[in-house]
């Protein structure tokens, strides 16, 4: 058995921030689970992790430098990404692992969400820009 995941096909991050909702065919209430968001066609970059535990507050973290937060619904996890760069426009995949109680369950690979970062460029602009190059 595999959990099915639904994601929006595309989201636009206008102000370098976006909410990506991962909807699961599984109720996460009272389960211990690890939901994560991965960047790239090969899902090589783990952008953000939400760890849910029946007895503790939700743990949200990124080991790859992304500014992220997470919110839990009964059958969903929403990732809130901030301070995105234009060059982080890419496809992002939701992943879920339900660890406890057994049996272990994970998801069928979803279709992913293309996040198009259109916001302000977050690189610092010089105070006195030099002559533009052709």
């Amino acid at each position: 058995n595999k959990i099915l995941v639904k994601q929006s096909p595309m989201l636009v991050a206008y102000d370098n921030a976006v909410n990506l909702s991962c909807k699961y065919s599984y109720n996460l209430f009272s389960r211990e689970f690890r939901a994560s968001l991965h960047k790239g066609l090969d899902s090589a970059v783990e952008v953000c992790v939400v760890y849910g535990n029946y007895s503790q507050q939700l743990q949200v973290y990124s080991k790859t430098g992304f500014n992220c937060d997470g919110k839990l619904g009964n059958e969903s996890v929403t990732f809130y990404l901030q301070n995105l760069y234009v060059n982080q426009t890419d496809i992002y995949f939701c992943k879920i692992e339900v660890m406890y109680p057994p049996p272990y369950l994970d998801n069928e690979k979803s279709n992913g969400t293309i996040i198009h970062v259109k916001g302000k460029h977050l690189c610092p602009s010089p105070l006195f820009p030099g002559p533009s190059k052709p």
Partner: antibody
Framework: EVQLVESGGGLVQPGGSLRLSCAAS?????????WGWIRQAPGKGLEWIGE???????YYSPSLKSRVTISRDNSKNTLYLQLNSLRAEDTAVYYC???????????WGQGTLVTVSS | DIQLTQSPSSLSASVGDRVTITCRAS??????????LHWYQQKPGKAPKLLIY???TLQSGVPSRFSGSGSGTDFTLTISSLQPEDFATYYC?????????FGQGTKVEIK
């Protein structure tokens, strides 16, 4: 038949680190089961240390979380346990085991003894 | 954490005796009709061996004199007719919640 063989035990100084290996045969550790480490202090009961899932995700006992790392090398079909800042109470036989569908531990290694002493 | 309390901690019995060991969990370990409670046998200097999983299912290769029962918080391991090779320490273990926890063990000795 699944076989698990631990190695790397021995005498370690307090404050030191240990890295134990668990070589698996008869089953590929990346193929779908989960794998755990358990320890048993001399004359005492069993204590769960942590586990690694076939996805590579790990989970550690809260009491050891800050000192322990479980990893694997799929090419060598081997699991590893790293434990840092060792103290006398870490003296134990360390076992690796496979978790079945219900997370019962259906295959165990023979264990390796770690003694923490100066 | 879920605490598992075994009783008795030790017992003396003779070959042929019926032996019962109980394991009480500090909270239910049931989920959708399954009990995530397992039993192991350990002999001195050896690794534990799985006897019963999911409260009552006999692990492959384990003699039928071993049986398990119970649900919720109260579980029992029964050896219907004790054999010489059954003198060992028995542990229960829950896998309903992390951290996985074990009972303190019950040592079965020869009377």
């Amino acid at each position: 038949e699944v076989q698990l063989v631990e190695s790397g035990g021995g005498l370690v100084q307090p404050g030191g680190s240990l890295r134990l290996s668990c070589a698996a045969s008869g089953y590929s550790i990346s193929s779908g089961y989960h794998w755990g480490w358990i320890r048993q202090a001399p004359g005492k009961g069993l204590e769960w240390i942590g586990e690694i899932y076939h996805s590579g995700s790990t989970y550690y006992s809260p009491s050891l979380k800050s000192r322990v790392t479980i990893s694997r090398d799929n090419s060598k079909n081997t699991l590893y346990l790293q434990l840092n800042s060792l103290r006398a109470e870490d003296t134990a036989v360390y076992y690796c085991a496979r978790k079945d569908y219900y997370y019962a531990l259906d295959y165990w290694g023979q264990g390796t003894l770690v003694t923490v002493s100066s | 954490d879920i605490q598992l309390t075994q009783s008795p901690s030790s017992l003396s019995a003779s070959v042929g005796d019926r032996v019962t060991i109980t394991c009480r969990a500090s909270q239910s370990v049931d989920f959708y009709g399954k009990s995530f409670l397992h039993w192991y046998q350990q002999k001195p200097g050896k690794a534990p061996k799985l006897l019963i999983y999911a409260a009552s299912t006999l692990q492959s290769g384990v003699p039928s004199r071993f049986s398990g029962s119970g649900s919720g918080t109260d579980f029992t391991l029964t050896i219907s007719s004790l054999q010489p090779e059954d003198f060992a320490t028995y542990y229960c273990q829950q896998s309903y919640r992390t951290p996985l926890t074990f009972g303190q063990g019950t040592k079965v000795e020869i009377k």
